[in-house]
Amino acid sequence: MNGSEYFVKIQSFLGGAPTEDLKALSQQNVSMDLATFMKLRTDAVLPLTVAEVQKLLGPHVEGLKAEERHRPVRDWILRQRQDDLDTLGLGLQGGIPNGYLVLDLSMQEALSGTPCLLGP
């Protein structure tokens, strides 16, 4: 069974998938469509790297642009380095500026919904 066939079989169960499962899926050429990606748990999507999301979505990655202001895409973009987002060539905006340090302050983030940044 190839990645696409596997994806079709598990598609309806993906809404509650944890980060680890999404990371594993990204290695299987599943080419997840944006409609499915948008239904994923935000907390499961946030830890994914740009490379992992690119692999997970395959050719559908360009659809991130159209959804960049919708969750979970918006929140995921806020967690990525702008330099990494730029490698996709989609014109995605809102990533962490080059030279900034991300502090993983759980309480700060829980309150504000965004990571705490320290300038260069």
Epitope: D33, L34, A35, M38, K39, H60, E62, G63, L64, K65, A66, E67, R69, H70, R71, L90, G91
Partner: antibody, heavy 119, light 108 residues
């Protein structure tokens, strides 16, 4: 056949609110965002915002922020656009338009709803 | 926001003639994020071209689109009477999404 059927024409007084509905049929409702675009008499097209029917997430054009609210009813495959604090400049034809999630173009449009704001 | 300026505003053309409509953006637009719509009198707009040059389903091949950066073009190669309409360009490269002011094409 894919169809978007909108509610009928409305006449409202300045300061009032209007709620326009858009019923979708012939496709998987949650695979497409629904956008709203308006057109004042003799004028061009103006994008108002969109709603993701799957999550209920909305994005609004800042020009309408605070005045526009988009909602959905998945069980009825219907989306709604409510515009409050109406003024004469809001007189226009309001269109719902389907946009596949992950794209930015509108491949199916409703027939339009004429909203007239007049005292 | 990105302002899309179309020219001409109005064009009166004889059948079989070639029509060229330009859409100039105030800032660069990624070509994948530009589309064209056709709106006939008293009708809803209809998708004509997406991603700058891709014809929407059912659109005749006499329509074509091209361009990049800030300059985009819609061409109707051999105008037919049914092409009388107003044409709009549209970008979703930058928020908020915007449309051009429209170009009305009339048949002589």
């Amino acid at each position: 056949e894919v169809q978007l059927v909108q509610s009928g024409a409305e006449v409202k007084k300045p300061g009032a609110s209007v709620k326009v509905s858009c019923k979708a049929s012939g496709y998987t409702f949650t695979d497409y965002n629904m956008d709203w675009v308006r057109q004042a008499p003799g004028q061009g097209l103006e994008w108002m915002g969109d709603i993701n029917p799957s999550t209920g997430g909305t994005i609004y054009n800042q020009k309408f922020s605070g005045r526009v609210t988009m909602t959905e009813d998945k069980s009825a495959s219907t989306v709604y656009m409510e515009l409050s604090s109406l003024r004469s400049e809001d007189t226009a034809v309001y269109y719902c338009a389907r946009r596949r999630i992950g794209t930015g173009y509108f491949d199916v449009w409703g027939q339009g709803t004429t909203v007239t704001v007049s005292s | 926001e990105i302002v899309l300026t179309q020219s001409p505003d109005f064009q009166s053309v004889t059948p079989k003639e070639k029509v060229t409509i330009t859409c100039s953006a105030s800032s660069s637009v990624i070509s994948s994020y530009l589309s064209w719509y056709q709106q006939k009198p008293d009708q809803s707009p209809k998708l004509l071209i997406y991603r700058t040059s891709n014809l929407a389903s059912g659109v005749p091949s006499r329509f074509s689109g091209s361009g990049s950066g800030t300059d985009y073009t819609l061409t109707i190669n051999s105008l037919e009477a049914e092409d009388a309409a107003t044409y709009y360009c549209h970008q979703w490269s930058s928020f908020p999404y915007t449309f051009g002011g429209g170009t009305k094409v009339e048949i002589k």
